[in-house]
């Protein structure tokens, strides 16, 4: 009779994470008697995967009924595969020994490779907002994929970016890998509605890449432009002065009127109008009683936007002369403005 051989016909098996791996093994003879065991790895540190004789292996099932007479098929299935299961699996025949079984013959091994999908890319921007013309960095991270080969691209509003650096870790062999990429983006005043997209392509995704997005609205700060104008007389001795706050983002804005350096009113932007580019406009007016002033009046519109240092614009109101019409505003810009009489 020929000596038993352990046959593992598959040199390698590739399985997607979450699926079941079938590791094939047959013996060429029923003797010598003794159990089959499956191990991951070789040598003293090898990990027992299945023992025909005893033990509880909840993820492992045998392909054939190992209790059947004359069985020579010792193939196993391992369920719910994860990248941590990758490695070389050996089917090993033991011979009955006293007191312990003796390793008799091993199969050549089957390398199990696990294809694991990358996690959804997470894009994060800078901690603080930045203003147009500044360059900001965005990071993109995705984890848990295998094999190591992966492609990452950056887009801004559908246009591919080129200024980025990408690392895949670890450099050496691993059960799974992570990718980290940093892209540099120059902000423009029109970027409130812009998106930065990180796109990850991997063999497990069947040509349908994963995308992570970041809205530049979370990153950009567009500072306002101020214009103070004097409106036509409303009534004898009254002048209407408006402060137009244009093209700002985000909406958080506080406006203070100063008369000759003294605070006369403070208000918070509420009913704003939105521009096509996502920035906001707002207008505040001040009704000044000219007869209450003997000297010329310096009116200042002071705006604190998004916690930044205040910016201001001033307008000199001549008390001696009869007020002239010094500008006009559309009805839309007056909508929602606040009107107060100052005495």
């Amino acid at each position: 009779e020929e000596e038993l051989q352990v046959i593992q016909p598959d040199k390698s098996v590739l399985v997607a994470a979450g699926e079941t791996a079938t590791l094939r093994c047959t013996a060429t003879s029923l003797i010598p008697v003794g159990p089959i065991q499956w191990f991951r790895g070789a040598g003293p540190g090898r990990e027992l995967i299945y023992n025909q004789k005893e033990g509880h292996f909840p993820r492992v099932t045998t392909v054939s009924d190992l209790t059947k007479r004359n069985n020579m098929d010792f193939s196993i299935r391992i369920g719910n595969i994860t990248p941590a299961d990758a490695g070389t699996y050996y089917c090993v025949k033991f011979r009955k020994g006293s007191p312990d079984d003796v390793e008799f013959k091993s199969g050549a091994g089957t390398e199990l490779s696990v294809r694991a999908k990358p996690s959804a890319p997470v894009v994060s921007g800078p901690a603080a907002r930045a203003t147009p013309q500044h360059t900001v960095s965005f990071t993109c991270e995705s984890h848990g994929f295998s094999p190591r080969d992966i492609t990452l691209k950056w887009f801004k509003n559908g246009n591919e970016l080129s200024d980025f650096q990408t690392n895949v870790d670890p450099v050496g062999e691993s059960v799974s890998y992570s990718i980290h990429s940093t892209a540099k983006v120059v902000l423009t005043r029109e970027d409130v509605h812009s998106q930065v997209i990180c796109e990850v392509a991997h063999v497990t995704l069947q040509g349908d890449p994963l995308r992570g997005t970041a809205n530049l609205s979370e990153t950009i700060r567009v500072p306002p432009t101020l214009e103070v104008t004097q409106q036509p007389v409303r009534a004898e001795n009254q002048v209407n002065v408006t402060c137009q706050v244009r093209k700002f983002y985000p909406q958080r804005l506080q406006l203070t009127w100063l008369e000759n350096g003294n605070v006369s009113r403070t208000e918070t932007a509420s009913t704003v109008t939105e521009n096509k580019d996502g920035t906001y406009n707002w207008m505040s007016w001040l009704l000044v009683n000219v007869s209450a002033h003997r000297d010329d009046v310096k009116l200042t519109c002071q705006v604190e936007h998004d916690g930044q240092p205040a910016v201001s614009k001033s307008h000199d109101l001549k008390v001696s002369a009869h007020p002239k019409e010094q500008g006009s505003n559309t009805a839309a810009e007056n909508t929602g403005s606040n009107e107060r009489n100052i005495y």
Epitope: K53, E54, L66, N70
Partner: antibody, heavy 121, light 111 residues
Amino acid sequence: EVKLLESGGGLVQPGGSLKLSCAASGFDFSRYWMSWVRQAPGKGLEWIGEINPDSSTINYTPSLKDKFIISRDNAKNTLYLQMSKVRSEDTALYYCATSFYGSSYWYFDVWGAGTTVTVSS
Amino acid sequence: DIVLTQSPASLAVSLGQRATISCRASESVDNYGISFMNWFQQKPGQPPKVLIYAASNQGSGVPARFSGSGSGTDFSLNIHPMEEDDTAMYFCQQSKEVPYTFGGGTKLEIK
């Protein structure tokens, strides 16, 4: 240590019934086929029958099929032999046995010490 | 059923000599390239103990003086050299198919 221990033997009248037990220890009982073998005084060995791990297959020697019932309780690690309509020729030492090492090639390498059944009026 | 006929029924052998016990099957017990024939030793008051499985393979812990041979329908168990401890009953058994059957036994004694 792999052990089998039979119990339940004793004196039984002809036509009567008796249930033998075999308690297994030292191995994963639920994975193994189990057999009953008997030996009449001064005689040879006779295989009675066997049961597979999940009780879905039970084989008997044809002449004993209608008299004996083999069962098992894996939760209790115990094999049973229900004997009925016993006759004097059923007087014997009853062994339980298994093929512990030969799962593919089959032979009895583990035996209990046996329990004696005497059929007499 | 496969019937196993053992011979001789009893045998006396001098210490140090060779004892040969034969077993003939009513039909071949070969399958899968091996012979499904086993040999057991039984001493008084003890259960049987396997000596040889698959015609020629020694059981674990069995002394080398016990050997088996044969195929198909004709098998033999050899004990050489005979020792005092070998006094016992010897049985052949086929495990090719159900019902498993045993030979009638051979009583081996020291001459």
